[in-house]
Interface confidence: low
């Protein structure tokens, strides 16, 4: 969906520093912040 | 809403290469990756690569290492995969999709063939 | 790489009857860190694009009826359909997301019986 607050995060490596390394992301709705916000540790 | 869509089909000769477009509409386009996936005729899904939209990291299905580049370009919101090489066994439906598959391009079908 | 089975293969069942597809992958997708699952569930119809219909192991996407449901942790996952319509026959895929390369199963054909 759209709208909604936005929330920056660091999209972290998910293993072994795998995939998606240190990437920012704005992410645009809480639909979308529920399904790429991987980290709560990473958040900014 | 998220749009992804995909250039039109392309019909290629064995050795040659393809570059497939996949513009972005409706979300902010750096904010996210853009995954390729392809799937053979009757065929299952195979993953090719991943391409971060916000710094440009690439991550590539092995297979495919060296023949496969993937670019964006942030000026257009536009994603591009470029298959070197071909042989008869990349024909396929190739799409596109937003980080691992939320939004998927509509697909490209691209036949290798003498 | 971690390997995605899908069983069965196809399975022909009944309108308003359940569906149930099940997906073993060959290692864990589950991470202890956010204790969630990094699986999801596509649906594709011939000459259409896969639509994703869960995420998270058990999360539905928004727009997504309530008859899709997902369940299962760790290796072990399953869609199910719970009273199955006509324009529910597709292929559907499970996929990971855990670590690259990403990998799908080889899907699931449903169909009417």
């Known amino acids: 969906g759209g709208g909604g607050s936005k929330h920056k995060c660091v999209q972290n490596s998910l293993v072994n520093n795998e995939t998606l390394e240190s990437i920012m992301n704005t992410l645009e709705s809480e639909e979308d912040f529920r399904k790429y916000f991987y980290y709560l540790e990473g958040s900014k | 809403q998220v749009q992804l869509v995909q250039s039109g089909a392309e019909v290629k000769k064995p050795g040659a290469s393809v570059k497939v477009s996949c513009k972005a509409s409706g979300y902010t386009f750096t904010s996210y990756g853009v995954s390729w996936v392809r799937q053979a005729p009757g065929q299952g899904l195979e993953w090719m690569g991943w391409?971060?939209?916000?710094?440009?990291?690439?991550n590539y299905a092995q297979k495919l290492q060296g023949r496969v580049t993937m670019t964006t370009d942030t000026s257009t919101s536009t994603a591009y995969m470029e298959l070197t090489s071909l042989r008869s066994d990349d024909t396929a439906v190739y799409y596109c999709?937003?980080?691992?598959?939320?939004?998927w391009g509509q697909g490209t079908l691209v036949t290798v063939s003498s | 790489d971690i390997q995605m089975t899908q069983s069965p293969d196809s399975l022909a069942v009944s309108l308003g009857e359940r569906a149930t597809i099940n997906c073993k992958s060959s290692q864990s997708v589950l991470y202890s860190s956010n204790n969630k699952n990094y699986l999801a569930w596509y649906q594709q119809k011939p000459g259409q694009p896969p639509k994703l219909l869960i995420y998270w192991a058990s999360t539905r996407e928004s727009g997504v009826p309530d008859r899709f449901s997902g369940s299962g942790s760790g290796t072990d996952f399953t869609l199910t359909i719970s009273s199955l319509q006509a324009e529910d026959v597709a292929v559907y895929y499970c996929q990971q997301y855990y670590s690259t390369p990403w990998t799908f199963g080889q899907g699931t054909k449903v169909e009417i019986k």
């Open positions: 391409i971060s939209a916000y710094n440009g990291n690439t």
């Open positions: 999709a937003r980080n691992w598959g939320d939004y």
